[in-house]
């Protein structure tokens, strides 16, 4: 497993159930880089942190997946968690 994947999983596992639900909803509308598709809503809403990490990495690869995860965390007001995720990714 890659460092970025571990960092994404760590961040998502640190969210409360309510925050994880909000994360998924924001992920459905977060601005994406050109050329990237959106994870289908139906698949997304039932996922736990582990499944969601796998889906983020498979859709966006590790580097962009970590950046996107950090941005959604920022959109949720979780800037410190976002900074920790990016620091872990760039170690």
């Amino acid at each position: 497993m890659g460092r970025a994947r571990d960092a994404i999983l760590d961040a998502l596992e640190n969210l409360t159930a309510e925050e994880l639900k909000k994360f998924k909803l924001k992920l459905l509308s977060v601005p994406l880089r050109e050329g990237y598709g959106r994870i289908p809503r139906g698949a997304l809403l039932s996922m736990d942190a582990l499944d969601l990490t796998d889906k983020l990495v498979s859709f966006y690869l590790e580097t962009y997946g970590a950046e996107l995860t950090a941005n959604v965390l920022r959109d949720m007001g979780l800037q410190e968690m976002a900074a920790a995720l990016q620091a872990a990714t760039h170690q």
């Epitope: 924001k26 977060v30 920022r74 959109d75 949720m76 800037q79 410190e80 900074a83």
Partner: antibody
Framework: QVQLQQPGTELVKPGASVKLSCRAS?????????????LEWIGNINLSNGRTNYN??FRAMATLTVDKSSSTAYTQLSSLTSEDSAVYYC?????????????WGQGTSVTVSS | NIVMTQYPKSMSLSIGERVTLRCKAS??????VSWYQQKPEQSPKLLIY???NRYTGVPDRFTGSGSATDFILTITSVQAEDLADYHC?????????FGAGTKLELK
């Protein structure tokens, strides 16, 4: 349009404390503005779970709390000096992305004077 | 802490002029920059968020651009009601920080 309700003015003595209130929702920020100066972020609180973040500059003097039952955010400012005379705004972040402050209260003017 | 530097500090202009306000972040803040308008004795109002997204109800003469460290607010044809202070702010990292503001005044 969401209206954030804040009381208008507070007059307090040096060394005393004041508790400011704001009827709000979601993430509520507190921002200080001295006369003729820029904006300074004090901190924020999430009304749904009580999660807080502070600007270290204000951590010793500001305490952010929430009363969920009335959807009211509070900031208690303690050991006040003349430097703390300012308008204190509350603001919400309701836009889904980029976490801007999209709704602002009208501000509470705090005057510290003996 | 991320420092937001705004310039110029003030601008004197005529109605109908094109205005460019600048904001520079001390480190990369992606697109996490907002612009606020504040008129005397009023609370700030959100104009632009995410560097370039116009907030609901904001006239299209206001345009935001930039990313990373350099950001611009452009007013294509300034109106009398636009004379105010303009603040940029970043929401990329805590503590959230603002620039010192730019004051738009009439010539």
């Amino acid at each position: 349009q969401v209206q954030l309700q804040q009381p208008g003015t507070e007059l307090v003595k040096p060394g005393a404390s004041v508790k400011l209130s704001c009827r709000a929702s979601g993430w509520t920020h507190w921002v200080k503005q001295r006369p003729g100066q820029g904006l300074e972020w004090i901190g924020n609180i999430n009304l749904s779970n009580g999660r807080t973040n502070y600007n270290e500059k204000f951590r010793a003097m500001a305490t952010l709390t929430v009363d969920k039952s009335s959807s009211t955010a509070y900031t208690q400012l303690s050991s006040l000096t003349s430097e703390d005379s300012a308008v204190y705004y509350c603001a919400n972040s309701m836009v889904p992305h980029f976490f801007p402050m999209d709704y602002w209260g009208q501000g509470t003017s705090v005057t510290v004077s003996s | 802490n991320i420092v937001m530097t705004q310039y110029p500090k003030s601008m004197s202009l005529s109605i109908g002029e094109r205005v460019t306000l600048r904001c520079k972040a001390s480190e990369n803040v992606g697109s996490y920059v907002s612009w606020y308008q504040q008129k005397p004795e009023q609370s700030p109002k959100l104009l632009i968020y995410g560097a370039s997204n116009r907030y609901t109800g904001v006239p299209d003469r206001f345009t935001g651009s930039g990313s990373a460290t350099d950001f611009i607010l452009t007013i294509t044809s300034v109106q009398a009601e636009d004379l105010a202070d303009y603040h940029c702010g970043q929401s990329y990292n805590y503590p959230l920080t603002f620039g010192a503001g730019t004051k738009l005044e009439l010539k």
